[in-house]
């Protein structure tokens, strides 16, 4: 075992001479992003105050390519890098095409309406006049491709004019536009060369040791890894912590059970029920508030102030009133819970599926006619699964090195 341990220690660290370095640099696991949209079936009725009715559409599947660049080894046992992602639509794996039309809340209109609720009335009027002149409406009928990667909307220019510096979009707006062909921030992580216990842990993100999106030091902490590999020699007492730039926060997953993936022993880590719990149910999450019902996290502070919420798909593990407020939601543990299967000896993921939902809080805002008589509701926009499983040559090498060889050596 000590010989195996030495081999693992030598080969998991982030060092050009280690076996896993190329695996770390260019992840050989094929990743897929599967997106499911909530098609709004009764937009006119919602504007009259009726309960929203949605139908899940998808999956629309994209192959996700990741590569690290600007890799710089620092002299404090850390390495800095940018990781770029590109997405390629996979028609054969998808249930529909990127040209499918989806009826969705108009995030720019309804988001701006909620944002303006407590703004001066004059600004509200200017925005209403503009919304009307520009033919904006509360719900839009757009293609999957437009929703994902961006569509031209005059409101982008309007918001940039009246809320300067707040909006990360220029000319086009798309929910995944910021992710495609771009990096997720400059990560600086420990290499494990000098101190293996800190391997993969994030030292800084974009030069920051902590973020300032939230209202408590604990919630602003950048904990864990960048979400791709973890320190080796895990036990069932270990937790899986990582910083997610998309969620603008650190997340901690807990050990659930042991298993086997293609002959390789794994630990399965899942989200605790408290991941998106509100502050009254789980006090450490108080810093993520102001909160609505438990089970959804307000990400407006890091998403251009729009009233956007992150949760498990179909409001799984959330306050039941959320799913009951929208017809067509069916939370299901099997289909909607996220998991990561990790090889505990190396801390390398074998199989994972991270599932999250993005929702919009919308309501009638007095003085903004476009919002009609909408009853306050957290309406799901889409949910996605980012999934990957080790396969092919990589899996064969991994199995040989970490399962077969130790067995042979043992005998």
């Amino acid at each position: 075992p000590s010989l195996i341990k030495q081999q693992v220690l030598k080969n998991v660290r982030i060092d050009p001479s280690s076996l896993s370095f190329n695996m770390w640099k260019e992840i050989p696991i094929p990743f897929y992003l599967s997106v499911y949209f909530f098609d709004v079936m009764n937009p006119s009725e919602i504007l009259k105050g009726e309960k929203p009715q949605v139908r899940e559409r998808g999956p629309y599947v994209y192959r996700e390519f990741r590569h690290k660049s600007n890799i710089t080894f620092n002299n404090n046992d850390t390495v800095s890098f940018l990781e770029y992602r590109t997405f390629q639509f996979q028609p054969s794996k998808s249930h529909g095409s990127e040209s499918d039309y989806i009826v969705m809340p108009n995030i720019l209109v309804l988001g701006a309406a909620v944002m303006m609720e407590n703004k001066p009335m004059t600004l509200k009027l200017i925005m209403t006049l503009a919304f009307t002149t520009l033919g904006e409406r509360a719900f839009m009928n757009r293609t999957v491709g437009e929703i994902m990667w961006g569509y031209k909307d005059p409101l982008v220019n309007l918001i940039n004019k009246y809320f300067p510096g707040m909006f990360p979009f220029k000319d086009k707006f798309g929910l995944f536009a910021e992710l495609n062909n771009s990096d997720s921030g400059l990560f600086t992580v420990f290499t494990g060369v000098q101190n293996i216990s800190r391997i993969h842990l994030v030292d800084k993100w974009n030069g920051l040791s902590k973020v300032d999106f939230w209202h408590s030091d604990q919630c602003n902490m950048i904990n864990g890894t960048s979400g791709q590999m973890w320190p080796p020699f895990m036990t069932p007492e270990s937790s899986l912590e990582f910083y997610s730039p998309e969620a603008c926060r650190s997340m901690k997953l807990m050990y659930k059970e042991s298993g086997v993936f293609e002959g390789i022993p794994t630990y399965r880590f899942v989200a605790p029920k408290t991941l998106f719990a509100n502050g009254s149910i789980y006090p450490p999450n108080e810093g993520f508030c102001p909160c609505l019902e438990s089970g959804i996290q307000n990400v407006s502070t890091c998403r251009f102030s729009a009233p956007l919420f992150l949760s498990h798909p179909h409001f799984l593990n959330a306050d039941p009133v959320l799913a009951e407020a929208v017809t067509g939601l069916h939370p299901n543990q099997e289909a909607h819970s996220l998991f990561l299967d990790i090889h505990p000896v190396t801390g390398i993921p074998m199989n994972c599926s991270v599932k999250l939902q993005l929702s919009l809080y919308m309501k009638s805002v007095a003085g903004i006619g476009q919002t009609g008589k909408i009853e306050p509701v957290v309406l799901p926009l889409l949910w996605f699964a980012e999934s990957g499983a080790m396969e092919g040559e990589t899996l064969h090498t991994f199995y040989t090195q970490l399962v077969l060889m130790p067995k042979v050596m043992h005998y």
């Epitope: 009027l125 006049l129 007095a366 003085g367 006619g369 009609g372």
Partner: antibody, heavy 119, light 110 residues
């Protein structure tokens, strides 16, 4: 059927004021903004200002600031535009307009009120 | 003086195609969608095209709109006698903080 009904034609002396009304029949005013637009003889359309009736919040075009007052009475579903210190160049047809069908910009207009300023 | 500039007149024989231009700048047409209104003499303006190229229900598909850079245009194909009217372009203007309109183009059917 929804209609925006405006007052009849008016003849005014320079320096005086005119108050034009716009009544929404078959609909309330409050939910959407109302704008006032004028059209001088042989000229284009010119925006004067807008109001959210429910709040009585008003936004005026710079050119008319201080001379125009737009108000609304939600109980009678009527909007008003008062223009002071009239000059001959204020001779125009004055329209009120609103959106009735969501997403259609200013798709409902009043029939217009001709205001003639003459000594 | 209108913020948006239109030619005063355009004409065509029945069945012909007529195009009307509308010119603005970065504070209006370049940044924002354009609407077109039709005004028959003695009547209130009527919405004809909105969001550059969308037609409200009831507007014939002979009418089409487009926008590029700081200008927009309205095309009437298969001109008919009832198309004789004034046509106004409209948009949002940042400097005005409100809607703005063109000076209008009188279309004559020869």
């Amino acid at each position: 059927e929804v209609q925006l009904v405006e007052t009849g034609a008016e003849v005014k002396k320079p320096g005086s004021s005119v108050k034009v009304s716009c009544k929404a029949s078959g609909d309330t005013l409050s939910s959407h903004a109302i704008i006032w637009v004028r059209q001088a003889p042989g000229q284009g359309l010119e925006w004067m200002g807008g109001i959210i009736p429910i709040f009585r919040t008003v936004n005026y075009a710079q050119k008319f600031q201080g001379r125009v007052t737009i108000t609304a009475d939600d109980s009678t579903s009527t909007a008003y535009m008062e223009l002071n210190d009239l000059r001959s160049e204020d001779t125009a047809v004055y329209y009120c307009a609103k959106t009735l069908n969501e997403g259609l910009p200013w798709d409902y207009w009043g029939q217009g009120t001709l205001v003639t300023v003459s000594s | 003086q209108s913020v948006l500039t239109q030619p005063p007149g355009a004409s065509g024989a029945p069945g012909q195609r007529v195009t009307i231009s509308c010119s603005g700048d970065s504070s209006n047409i370049e940044s924002y969608a354009v609407n077109w209104y039709q005004q028959v003499p003695g009547m209130a303006p009527k919405l004809l095209i909105y969001r550059d190229n969308q037609r409200p229900s009831g507007v014939p598909d002979r009418f089409s709109g487009s926008r590029s850079g700081t200008s927009a245009s309205l095309a009437i194909s298969g001109l008919q006698s009832e198309d004789e009217a004034d046509y106004y372009c409209g948009s949002w203007d940042d400097n005005l903080n409100g809607p703005t309109f063109g000076g209008g183009t009188k279309v004559t059917v020869l």
